[in-house]
């Protein structure tokens, strides 16, 4: 009840009081990506730095093989930013010739994989058309939201084109999650 | 252990139970910027409204001289949005003439200053090329992530060009942090 | 005091310890919008999915008639992303003819309604000029920040043009809030 004091005698097993500093948390930062085969019709996943610089994982939140592993069930805030950079796209040349065109685009997806499900679940997507004329371009896509996750769930960040990801600085491209 | 009840006898000194309403928190909103000298090769810092309107600081999180002061060590979620607005950039004229060009850009950086470190640490950066043709333009850059901060750390928001920041409304440009 | 153990005897009534899993939380996802009359000079509000797929409301946070209802006073993190999509705007044609023009724009506002206030309060605004040349375009606007809300407050998401909102996928356009 509102205003009720949650002394131990009031605790429910399913929602114990717990020290905030003990909650699973991770902030991962970008590293240079190694070329890998990715499944057709599936965006490639980024891999991440998990302990150097600003990056960390704590309280049983582990990072392995491009995935953040969810160590306990609960509501998590999950976020990522990917900074993209590129040269003039073909799209702009076609557009200059006056022919409308489905533009080039950049996309970030935060994906959940559950071993018992055959298909990954897309939790968050940021997608943007890019039709730049006559120049280099760069821009970030930011995503963040709360999800109910289960112990054993795995999170990854997929992008439409790994070669466009700016991997030069840990503050430009990152991925994180924390138990609320 | 999962499901363990965190009654007082189980508490660790380094991670005590604590009332959520007692945690350091701040949400700062934009105000008109006063012209100030800033260091060469360093983006100027914004200053903020700390208590009028939607703005607040609480539980020992203080704002002073463009900095948010971190009153206790822990993991914080830090966020900012800066809305930029401008006129057509020169870049667009060069582009119209068909010459590729490094575009004009807008950048936001959330920076951590630690007195014992000589160099500030860039926690988050949002940077975007801007090549607009024949019009006024406006757009936001949003940033947010979790960081392990130490008591005494100071946070600020730096921008590439203060004159492009939209300071007209508290909901367009803001900066905040809260202990998780 | 810093480092103090918040055992029940130290609890204050106004800030009781409480189980995190018991806090009001919601994540709402996009659905196809039904055309509705909206007030002149006020952006239309989106309505949302509250229980299917990734969407949920819990712990007395309820969704009704386009509003999230705040069930208890406190500091909330509130967020939304809206993905917009459109065809070439007139603005681009005018621009191609060489006449500067106030550009078309897309705007998202997270608004608080308090029954005792005559006017809604705009908590967050993301606004972006859109001047695309010769193509379909799409892009997200993301917002998120912390606010002190009162029991009975209502939150909604308003957009500049409902017909431009991408309602096709729950991961592209969403709205959420959780008590910190």
């Amino acid at each position: 009840l509102k205003g009720q004091e949650f002394a131990p005698s009031h605790q429910q097993v399913y929602a114990p009081l717990r020290a905030d500093g003990d909650k699973p948390r991770a902030h991962l930062t970008v590293v240079r990506q190694t070329p890998t085969q990715h499944l057709k019709n599936q965006f490639p996943a980024l891999h991440w730095e998990h302990e150097l610089g600003l990056a960390f994982t704590k309280n049983r939140m582990n990072y392995t093989n491009k995935f953040l592993l969810i160590p306990e069930s609960g509501d998590y805030f999950v976020y990522s930013q990917v900074t993209f950079r590129g040269m003039t796209s073909e799209c702009s040349e076609i557009r200059q010739a006056g022919r409308p065109n489905k533009p080039d685009s950049i996309t970030v997806v935060i994906t959940k994989v559950t071993d018992s499900y055959p298909e990954p679940t897309q939790l968050l997507m940021g997608t943007k058309s890019v039709c730049e004329v006559g120049s280099n371009w760069f821009q970030p896509i930011y995503l963040g939201a709360m999800f109910s996750l289960q112990e054993g769930d795995k999170l990854m960040v997929n992008v439409s084109d790994i070669s466009l990801v700016d991997y030069t600085k840990e503050d430009k491209t990152f991925f994180g999650a924390f138990l609320l | 252990l999962k499901g363990q009840e965190f009654a007082p006898s189980h508490q660790q000194v380094y991670a005590p139970l604590r009332a959520d309403g007692d945690k350091p928190r701040a949400h700062l909103t934009v105000v008109r910027q006063t012209p100030t000298q800033h260091l060469k090769n360093q983006f100027p810092a914004l200053h903020w409204e700390h208590e009028l309107g939607l703005a607040f600081t609480k539980n020992r999180m203080n704002y002073t001289n463009k900095f948010l002061l971190i009153p206790e060590s822990g993991d914080y979620f830090v966020y900012s949005q800066v809305t930029f607005r401008g006129m057509t950039s020169e870049c667009s004229e060069i582009r119209q003439a068909g010459r590729p060009n490094k575009p004009d850009s807008i950048t936001v950086v959330i920076t951590k200053v630690t007195d014992s470190y000589p160099e500030p640490t860039q926690l988050l950066m949002g940077t975007k090329s801007v090549c607009e043709v024949g019009s006024n333009w406006f757009q936001p850059i949003y940033l947010g992530a979790m960081f392990s901060l130490q008591e005494g750390d100071k946070l600020m928001v730096n921008v590439s060009d203060i004159s492009l920041v939209d300071y007209t409304k508290e909901d367009k440009t803001f900066f905040g942090a809260f202990l998780l | 005091l810093k480092g103090q153990e918040f055992a029940p005897s130290h609890q204050q009534v106004y800030a009781p310890l409480r189980a995190d899993g018991d806090k009001p939380r919601a994540h709402l996802t996009v659905v196809r919008q039904t055309p509705t009359q909206h007030l002149k000079n006020q952006f239309p509000a989106l309505h949302w999915e509250h229980e299917l797929g990734l969407a949920f409301t819990k712990n007395r946070m309820n969704y009704t008639n386009k509003f999230l209802l705040i069930p208890e006073s406190g500091d909330y993190f509130v967020y939304s992303q809206v993905t917009f999509r459109g065809m070439t705007s007139e603005c681009s044609e005018i621009r191609q003819a060489g006449r500067p023009n106030k550009p078309d724009s897309i705007t998202v506002v997270i608004t608080k309604v308090t029954d005792s206030y005559p006017e809604p309060t705009q908590l967050l605004m993301g606004t972006k000029s859109v001047c695309e040349v010769g193509s379909n375009w799409f892009q997200p606007i993301y917002l998120g920040a912390m606010f002190s809300l009162q029991e009975g407050d209502k939150l909604m998401v308003n957009v500049s043009d409902i017909s431009l909102v991408d309602y096709t996928k729950e991961d592209k356009t969403f709205f959420g809030a959780f008590l910190l």
Partner: antibody
Amino acid sequence: QVQLQESGPGLVKPSETLSLTCTVSGGSISSYFWSWIRQPPGKGLEWIGYIYYSGNTKYNPSLKSRVTISIDTSKNQFSLKLSSVTAADTAVYYCARETGSYYGFDYWGQGTLVTVSS
Amino acid sequence: DIQMTQSPSSLSASVGDRVTITCRASQSINNYLNWYQQRPGKAPKLLIYAASSLQSGVPSRFSGSGSGTDFTLTISSLQPGDFATYYCQQSYSTPRTFGQGTKLEIK
């Protein structure tokens, strides 16, 4: 140039409600904080409260139970109501603008004297 | 509430004099301190904001200094129009509070 002008009755009876309006000209009422401040004859300045264009208000705790400040953005006006007045509420009432905490009250009305007397 | 205490409460000086008025806050207000001049029958006028920033249009003989709890307004060379009452005001928190005023009179 921004100008503020207070208007309202100069005489109010005890126990009644004092009502004043401030009209802002030469600029928009949006994006600023609009305060009422009063000064009893021969005494110092007392802040009553502010309103933001969105309707967000904050009042001096010493007066909070009796004060209501409202705003009409379409008319570029904001108003003060002070209920249950006594002779101690006799003062010159000023409206003033604050851009933000950093900047102080940069524009003031000329003030209007309100006397509480039967 | 934050209490603001000005000293002196009154001051006599002559044209051309250098005058200093002090203001003390009951707790730290960083640099959120403003100074106003009020002539008889007129509204206050902002002179200095943020402890030391000169408001546009105010003569440069007015200056402010200080931070935390102790602040000073200095008039470097008094002019005839400067004889008035001066108030300090904190804008660090609400309620906004003013000092009791310093009346500057001609000697």
